[in-house]
Interface confidence: medium
């Protein structure tokens, strides 16, 4: 969380930004707040990304005005113009790449006075895990796969029942780069499990944290799993 | 009303290049929109080719990017589609559609449609 | 890539009925799916965006529902030209892609 003040005359506003993440080959959102003026012609919005010469975007007297934008960022972001008199100024991102990840600064003047907020935008990938019974191994074993991770994630085994353990002798982990041949298809095989035990799969890198979780019993399969960013908000 | 119109050979030869062109009429191409290619083979479902912006920037499908070039002619307000080394497996009904992007919504939908060419590949 | 699949593949309802097509995505596309329809020697017609959101003109029998990786396209009651075949399409990741269809037939 970043809180930005600034000065005009007597006048600064408050800007607040949050460190985000953006999953490449996604649509992203730059996340960017101010205090309401309900005048919106009087509101300009400007977001600048650190060493690049041209704006990312900007919106002044209720509308779009690319005149200035960068060649990289050419139809590739909205703010949600609607929200803006409400103090909204996020930015929409399309397409997210690798090369997306910088220092953005979300930059906002209104009748109120100016004021100004850097962001931390990072940009990898990231997908939640899937664990299934694997039935076509010779022992009873698990597999854990999600579809799309960047940079390499390291992956960890977990057991409710055998706490502290260390699986990386019974586990095998591959990486399969996928077709845009930037993001990897995450691949890890459990061996030798038992029954009526619930086993996580853990999968981390610099950018997000995603968890698998599978119980297994005599009468049941149940499955969870959650996904969640790192150093965000 | 946006009104999209494809134009284009009808039929291909195996490994030759297929070349269609999209006329956009009641609207600029160089509107905030991405305008894409989209195509259905005949009795199948429908797989989207590439995007384009007024700018030139595009997005192609992996499965295609290798043989795909999508361009826009701002003066004629129209954007074109070329697939070189065509197969029998490129025969389709090729589509041309605008995104729905609208200032503060999402891209992505396809809210204005051409009607349609079919492309067959024989020899 | 991600993969949209449709059920049922075809699915016979009478008219005034209810219909329910489901539409199911490989990973998750948060909100952003679309539902569109083709009637035969036609271009694929936007009914649904957002996931709810009825495209303008779209009468209110239509309506989308879901988020995450499990949709629903349901007509309220049927009218004799809602016939035809129901496509999803998500739009959170390129390359968009479509579901292989729903024919929805009278029964």
């Known amino acids: 969380l970043i809180i930005g003040f600034g000065i005009s005359g007597k006048h600064f506003i408050t800007v607040t930004t949050f460190t985000s993440a953006g999953n490449i080959g996604e649509d992203g959102t730059l996340s960017c707040t101010f205090e309401p003026d309900i005048k919106l012609n009087g509101i300009v919005i400007q977001w600048l990304k650190e060493g690049i010469k041209g704006l990312v975007h900007e919106f002044k007297e209720g509308k779009d005005d690319l005149s200035q934008q960068h060649e990289m960022f050419r139809g590739r972001t909205a703010v949600f113009a609607d929200q803006v008199v409400v103090g909204n100024a996020s930015l929409r991102l399309k397409n997210v790449q690798l090369t997306d990840a910088g220092t953005y600064t979300c930059y906002i003047r209104t009748s109120k006075g100016k004021g100004n907020a850097n962001l931390e935008y990072k940009t990898g990938a990231f997908s939640m895990p899937e664990i299934n019974v694997d039935y076509n191994a010779s022992s009873e074993s698990l597999r854990c796969e999600a579809p799309r991770w960047f940079p390499q994630p390291t992956v960890a085994w977990a057991s409710q029942v055998d706490q502290g353990a260390n699986f990386s002798e019974v586990s095998n982990t591959s990486f399969e780069l996928n077709s845009e041949n930037v993001t990897m298809k995450v691949v890890s095989v459990l061996y030798n499990v038992t029954i009526n035990n619930t086993y996580s799969c853990m999968i981390e890198n610099d950018i997000a944290k995603a968890t698998g979780d599978i119980k297994v019993t005599d009468s049941e399969v149940k499955r969870r799993s959650q996904l969640q960013l790192l150093n965000s908000g | 009303q946006v009104q999209l119109q494809e134009s284009g050979p009808g039929l291909v030869k195996p490994s030759g290049t297929l070349s269609l062109t999209c006329a956009v009429s009641g609207g600029s191409i160089s509107s905030s929109n991405w305008w894409s290619w989209v195509r259905q083979p005949p009795g199948k479902g429908l797989e989207a080719i590439g995007e384009i912006y007024h700018s030139g920037n595009t997005n192609y499908n992996p499965s295609l990017k290798s043989r795909v070039t999508i361009s826009v002619d701002k003066s004629k307000n129209q954007f074109s589609l070329k697939l070189s080394s065509v197969t029998a497996a490129d025969t389709a009904i090729y589509y041309c559609?605008?995104?729905?992007?609208?200032?503060?919504?999402?891209?992505?939908?396809?809210?204005?449609w051409g009607q349609g060419t079919l492309v067959t590949v024989s020899s | 890539e991600i993969v949209m699949t449709q059920s049922p593949a075809t699915l016979s309802v009478s008219p005034g009925e209810r219909a329910t097509l489901s539409c199911r995505a490989s990973q998750s596309v948060n909100s952003n799916l679309a539902w569109y329809q083709q009637k035969p020697g036609q271009a694929p017609w936007l009914l649904i965006y957002g996931a709810s959101t009825r495209a303008t003109g779209i009468p209110a029998r239509f309506s989308g529902s879901g988020s995450g990786t499990e949709f629903t396209l349901t007509i309220s009651s049927l009218q004799s030209e809602d016939f035809a075949v129901y496509y999803c399409q998500q739009y959170n990741h390129w390359p968009y892609t479509f579901g292989q269809g729903t024919k929805l037939e009278i029964k």
């Open positions: 559609a605008r995104d729905g992007y609208s200032s503060g919504w999402y891209w992505g939908y396809f809210d204005y």
